[in-house]
């Protein structure tokens, strides 16, 4: 049988220079910081290989006593990075990832940065600011997103296979036109998921099938012309 696999795949985009932040502009910093909510938690999806900046509650640094970043990553002991204003000293406990650092000197900027986000940075990050008026927290459930690699090929007559490989979270695959489909998911130890959808089209007037992959990092469509039915020579449409 001729190879009509038309193997198409996305190239992984390079997001190394891209960066994302949920930080407020300095002008938006709440002067009357006592009105700031004592605890704010945010779910934050971040693309792998981007840079991420995580922020403390918007409290003027002059009112600070201690800033602590608490970082809880899967399968690792809790890491803390602390800065004490009075003595101008910083202290780290159980912190081994050199890509997670203060944005600059903590006496000037309390934000935390992750350079080139990796899957291992999935976890919970919390800034605790100790002030004379009490403690203020801001937490982030950081969800690292991994763009799946998408391939589409035929493995036998009028059957096509669409794969979204090593995505995080799992991608969703749909087809135009709809076929007789079976979908499987394969979970990897690093938290990524491969989704494989195999479809068959019995209807002979289906010429080309399109696999549409939906993912939080963006959508991708690939299409392929189906091989003829074996033995079919001529038909009028």
């Amino acid at each position: 049988q001729p190879n009509n696999s038309l193997m198409l795949q996305t190239s992984k985009e390079n997001h190394a220079l891209a960066s994302s932040s949920l930080c407020m502009d300095e002008k938006q910093i709440t002067q009357n910081y006592s009105k700031v909510l004592a605890e704010v938690n945010t779910s934050w999806p971040v693309k792998m290989a981007t840079n991420a900046v995580l922020c403390c509650p918007p409290i003027a640094l002059r009112n600070l006593i201690i800033i602590t970043w608490e970082i809880i990553l899967r399968g690792q002991p809790s890491c803390t990075k602390a800065y004490k204003k009075e003595t101008n000293e910083t202290k780290e406990t159980n912190c081994t990832d050199e890509r997670i650092t203060w944005v600059s000197r903590p006496d000037q900027n309390s934000d935390l940065q992750i350079r080139t986000v990796a899957i291992t940075h999935d976890g919970y990050y919390r800034c605790i600011m100790v002030t004379p008026d009490g403690n203020f927290h801001r937490g982030y459930h950081l969800q690292v997103l991994v763009t799946p690699e998408v391939t589409l090929f035929q493995n036998r007559n009028r059957t096509a296979v669409c794969k979204a490989v090593a995505g995080k979270p799992a991608a969703h695959i749909s087809w135009i036109p709809e076929g007789d489909c079976a979908t499987k998911q394969e979970y990897w130890s690093n938290g990524t998921v491969t989704v494989k959808s195999t479809c068959h089209w019995e209807v002979h007037n289906v010429s080309t099938v399109t696999c549409h992959v939906s993912h939080l990092t963006g959508n991708k469509s690939l299409y392929i012309e189906l091989l003829p039915v074996p033995g079919a020579k001529k038909s009028a449409k």
């Epitope: 049988q1 001729p2 036109p177 010429s207 399109t210 392929i224 012309e225 039915v229 020579k233």
Partner: antibody, heavy 114, light 107 residues
């Protein structure tokens, strides 16, 4: 890069037949459907049919069934379309296309005139 | 057969205009399509493949969107060299079917 080179212009009498060729390069000829499209002067585009060189399987639009014949010669990587019982309304440019319609030949003008 | 209803059939335009052309598939049947540009005496040139993918070398002022049965082709800022006829082509079902074309004319 896929290239489709089509044969030259033809002038035919009504009732005659014409056979157009389309020579492919730059891709696996036997692995992709070859399609043929008609465009009459000042008109839109009409799909005639397609052929799968790997097996010889063919589909025709009903309008062209019986008068259009699609064939291939895999040894020369060439697709052919023969149109019989020509009439004036067959005067048109005929295009071959492949790779799911993403690669087109430049077209062959067929003029049917008495 | 799937009919492709393309509109408008003609459009009077000026340089710099935003141009929008639509194609709709009949029978409520989801399809995939290409968008082509054709100039007099030339073969159609593929601009947008698979509804929204800009072909290599095609200026970014051209774009395609939509899915299912309703599709849109846009020229964000018309240039003089864009004066041509534009066609959609559904390639999901046999027979493949084209829209009737949209001819752009300078005002």
């Amino acid at each position: 890069q896929v290239q489709l080179v089509q044969s030259g212009a033809e002038v035919k009498k009504p009732g005659a037949s014409v056979k157009l060729s389309c020579k492919a390069s730059g891709h696996t000829f036997t692995s992709y459907w070859m399609h043929w499209v008609k465009q009459a002067p000042g008109q839109g585009l009409e799909w005639i049919g397609n052929i799968y060189p790997g097996s010889g399987s063919i589909n025709y639009d009903e309008k062209f069934q019986g008068r259009a014949t699609l064939t291939v010669d895999t040894s020369t990587r060439t697709a052919y379309m023969e149109l019989s019982s020509l009439r004036s309304e067959d005067t048109a440019v005929y295009y071959c296309l492949t790779m799911t319609g993403t690669s087109w030949g430049r077209g062959t003008l067929v003029t049917v005139s008495s | 057969d799937i009919q492709m209803t393309q509109s408008p059939s003609s459009l009077s335009v000026s340089v710099g205009d935003r141009v929008t052309i639509t194609c709709q598939a009949s029978q409520g049947t989801p399809i995939n399509l290409h968008w082509f540009q054709q100039k007099p005496g030339k073969a159609p040139k593929l601009l947008i493949s698979g509804a929204s993918n800009l072909e290599d070398g095609v200026p970014s002022r051209f774009s395609g969107s939509g899915s299912g049965t309703d599709f849109t082709f846009t020229i964000s800022s018309l240039q003089p060299e864009d004066i041509a006829t534009y066609y959609c082509l559904q390639f999901t079902y046999i027979p493949w079917t084209f829209g009737q074309g949209t001819k752009l004319e300078i005002k």
